[in-house]
């Protein structure tokens, strides 16, 4: 009915799903038929599929709807030409002519939009040991209009962490600990600059890689050893020791000794596997009294770090397998015999 | 028209700080970083560090972290650079510059310049 | 930190006659964020070319700029003796933002 709908104006911002414009064609056939029908389609000036048409069969009203979000910045003016058609063919000899087109100028004004991340997340991956001030990721965003952004941390608990406002640049500010906690987990934030201070926000994760510098402990409290005064015969405890450091693919490799020489005549060290080690006695003669004995667990890493534990072990006097002590003598009772 | 005036020079004397000013007309402050550039005839142009006014975001450079505090008052759209325990070294020229709006990084105007001479 | 290295460091040039000063770079710099300031002895440093080959406002067309990567360069087509100053490159591709020691340009 009509080539020509003129300009139409529309801010980027229009839901998607709104009509923006409604056509109409005529068509002499028989109603409600294939041959009087009509459909629309979009010929030109929307190779983005932006938007769509949709038919009302009963009226062969089109409906020009937003199909996809519209952006000023890659077309701010459109020039777009649909086609009514028959669903079915039309009989031989006869063609669509002119006034099966029509146009109309789609105008897209400019809405101020936040910056926008070229990731959701980034990511990077350091060394825990890294020097303070050293460069340990870098995010960018950008701003649909061409405006600068002004970046910022959010969420940096721990203080590690300094952002480069301008560039986006990251850099560590104290020391980095992978024991405390990997990924490290930061939100940056992107300001656009120029006014009307939008903003996104995007993740940071800062995966630490391990170094070396946990020593050997025991993986649990040993207090309580005891063993029964006096000994029948020597006797032995089993002992496990763990660090805080990471173990890929293999468990820990400790070694075991004891952590002084004195030590030697009365105990000797043997190792079980690479956590496990077992205490024992070299002889019976022990007093009825606590006995510390220091071990020396090394961890064979790069650089080696060495842990001195103290295993405290109590010969008592038992009564039906339990230390026994005389009343007012409580404090400390060893729980765990041998 | 867009205008950076800075306050005079200053003579101090080493151990003291200065603290320095770089008033901003014409254009609207919070908008834009301010930056602070020194200039001495061994090391030419040096970059100290930016302010954004538009909500405090600042950034250093490594070497002068420590010595240098950057600070903005919105209501009197100035930008203020303290310097601290000064040494014969910090003497130069130090210029405050306007950062582009848009995404070059250029300093489109600059001040006067503001020279500190550090001296017993 | 990247380093801006210009060459030469003193030229001098007729008028009229074609200059070319060169900026090179440590490592590798977006053509976005290189930029040309001039300065003038007592004068503050002026923008000058912004984003390698973009004249700022004011700039006569005898200027030029060029380049990519690590090697850039300005260029005066025909030299007038208001051109004669001290020429800055600078990038702002990483922090700190750096500039060269500078080109000084003299009126032979």
């Known amino acids: 009915e009509k080539s020509d709908y003129g300009n139409l104006t529309l801010a980027e911002d229009t839901n998607i799903g709104s009509t923006i414009l409604t056509i109409q064609a005529t068509d002499a056939d028989e109603p409600f038929t294939g041959s009087s029908k009509i459909l629309y389609h979009i010929i030109k000036g929307d190779s983005e599929g932006r938007l769509g048409v949709d038919t009302d069969p009963h009226t062969n009203t089109g409906y020009v709807i937003i199909k996809k979000p519209l952006d000023f910045e890659t077309a701010a003016v459109s020039n777009i030409v649909f086609k009514a058609e028959n669903p079915e063919p039309l009989v031989f000899g006869v063609k669509y002519n002119a006034s099966s087109f029509a146009k109309f100028t789609l105008i897209v004004t400019d809405v101020n939009e936040a910056p926008q991340f070229s990731q959701h997340v980034f990511q990077a991956k350091v060394s825990e040991d890294v020097a303070i001030g050293t460069k340990v990721g870098n995010v960018t965003a950008k701003d649909p209009e061409g405006l600068d952004i002004s970046y910022s941390l959010r969420g940096d608990t721990r203080g590690w962490l300094k952002i480069d406002h301008v560039t986006g640049e990251i850099f560590s500010v104290a020391p980095l600990d992978r024991e405390a906690g990997s990924p490290y987990r930061v939100q940056v934030v992107a300001t656009e600059v120029g006014g009307s201070s939008l903003s996104s926000v995007s993740e940071f994760h800062l995966i630490l890689m391990d170094v070396n510098d946990n020593p050997p402990r025991l993986a649990k409290d040993y207090t309580g050893l005891f063993f029964c005064h006096p000994l029948s015969a020597p006797g032995s405890l089993i002992f496990e020791a763990t660090d805080d450091d990471q173990h890929l693919f293999r468990g820990p490799h400790f070694t075991f000794s004891l952590g002084s020489g004195s030590l030697q005549n009365d105990w000797e060290v043997s190792k079980i596997n690479g956590t496990h080690a077992r205490l024992s006695t070299r002889h019976t003669e022990f007093e009825e009294r606590e006995y510390v004995v220091l071990i020396r667990i090394n961890d064979g890493g790069r650089p080696p770090l060495e842990g001195i534990v103290s295993l405290p072990v109590t010969f008592c006097s038992c009564v039906e397998g339990s230390c026994f002590r005389p009343a007012g003598h409580q404090t400390g009772i060893p729980t765990v015999g041998m | 028209q867009v205008q950076l005036q800075q306050s005079g020079a200053e003579l101090v004397k080493p151990g003291a700080s200065v603290r320095m000013s770089c008033k901003s007309s014409?254009?609207?402050?919070?908008?834009?970083?301010i930056h602070w550039v020194r200039q001495t005839p061994g090391q030419g142009l040096e970059w100290i560090g930016a302010?954004?006014?538009?909500?405090?975001?600042?950034s250093y450079n490594q070497k002068f972290r420590g010595k240098v505090t950057l600070t903005a008052d919105k209501s009197s759209s100035t930008a203020y650079m303290q310097l601290n325990s000064l040494t014969s070294e910090d003497s130069a020229v130090y210029y405050c510059?306007?950062?582009?709006?848009?995404?070059?990084?250029?300093?489109?105007?600059w001040g006067q310049g503001t020279t500190v001479t550090v001296s017993s | 930190d990247i380093v801006l290295t210009q060459s030469p460091a003193i030229m001098s040039a007729s008028l009229g006659e074609r200059v070319t000063m060169t900026c090179t770079a440590s490592s590798s710099v977006s053509s976005s964020y290189l930029h040309w300031y001039q300065q003038k002895p007592g004068s503050s440093p002026k923008l000058w070319i912004y984003s390698t080959s973009n004249l700022a406002s004011g700039v006569p067309a005898r200027f030029s700029g060029s380049g990519s990567g690590t090697s850039y360069s300005l260029t005066i087509s025909s030299m007038a003796a208001e051109d004669a100053a001290t020429y800055y490159c600078h990038q702002y591709l990483r922090s700190p933002p750096t500039f060269g020691s500078g080109t000084k340009l003299e009126i032979k």
């Open positions: 510059a306007r950062q582009t709006a848009r995404t070059t990084r250029a300093m489109d105007y």
């Open positions: 302010i954004y006014p538009g909500n405090g975001d600042n």
């Open positions: 014409g254009y609207t402050f919070t908008s834009y970083n």
